[in-house]
Amino acid sequence: VPLSRTVRCTCISISNQPVNPRSLEKLEIIPASQFCPRVEIIATMKKKGEKRCLNPESKAIKNLLKAVSKERSKRSP
């Protein structure tokens, strides 16, 4: 990762675009910290391993988070 852009927040732009949970490889939620004052959500897509920053305030993204956590709770014993 180019060091000059790792100093603070990970996201340069954020997307409102709905993401199909089936196309997700991974979903990372980075809490606010001393390095970045905002919660950041990074989706890693199965296709080409694209990583996309999502808007935590977007209704579509909130629904995605709910769907993913529901799926996780189903899987856990």
Partner: antibody, heavy 124, light 109 residues
């Protein structure tokens, strides 16, 4: 439609200052990182500066570091470039450009929307 | 600092022909960080390709990108009259954060 319109260019003497503005419309400005890119007469493209969507991540090309300041006002949908201590080599067309939705330090989605540019001429 | 070199400097071709433009980096670049732009005289640049091979919105499928490491290619499968322009590759990396290549001019033979 999605649009970026630059203004503030002009003829200025070496050592003086100028502030460029870029008015955004047709999209949610506060969700996108923004860049300034310049092009000297008859030359190629040179990246100048970038600012993150919330206004905190700011980075500059070595050629302008310490002289230029990028900023934004999300309430006014406007991007700025404050240029101080101008030199003859800063003469160029200055473009503002939007960084693609979802861009981050791991994946670069390119500069997907550009303005038509504003011309800055530094001459005595 | 990573330097991008584009070749050839000028490519003279006829409409309908295939154009192959090369972009070479002085050090390895992640394909996640490579983009291509088109610029016509008197106009702003236009994003064609990001992530080395993903077409930007609205870009015709005659444009394709490929490559990895230090060697990247933009291919225009069949040149249309509106494709004659200057093409720039660009990488995002550390210090300077963004770098453009010097450009390749595609002109009419």
């Amino acid at each position: 439609q999605v649009q970026l319109v630059e203004s503030g260019g002009g003829v200025v003497q070496p050592g003086r200052s100028l502030r460029l503005s870029c008015a955004a419309s047709g999209f949610t400005f506060s969700r996108f990182g923004m860049h300034w890119v310049r092009q000297a007469p008859g030359k190629g493209l040179e990246w100048v500066a970038v600012i993150g969507y919330a206004g905190d991540n700011k980075y500059y090309a070595d050629s302008v570091k310490g002289r230029f300041t990028i900023s934004r006002d999300n309430s006014k949908n406007t991007l700025y470039l404050q240029m101080n201590s101008l030199r003859a080599e800063d003469t160029a067309v200055y473009y503002c450009a939007r960084e693609g939705a979802g861009s981050n330090i791991y994946y670069y989605y390119g500069m997907d929307v550009w303005g038509q540019g504003t011309t800055v001429t530094v001459s005595s | 600092e990573i330097v991008l070199t584009q070749s050839p400097g000028t490519l003279s071709l006829s409409p309908g022909e295939r154009a192959t433009l090369s972009c070479r980096a002085s050090q390895s670049v992640s394909s996640s960080y490579l983009a291509w732009y088109q610029q016509k005289p008197g106009q702003a640049p236009r994003l064609l390709i990001y992530g080395a091979s993903s077409r930007a919105t609205g870009i015709p499928d005659r444009f394709s990108g490929s490559g990895s490491g230090t060697d990247f290619t933009l291919t225009i499968s069949r040149l249309e009259p509106e494709d004659f322009a200057v093409y720039y590759c660009q990488q995002y990396g550390s210090s300077p954060i963004f770098t453009f290549g010097p450009g390749t001019k595609v002109d009419i033979k």
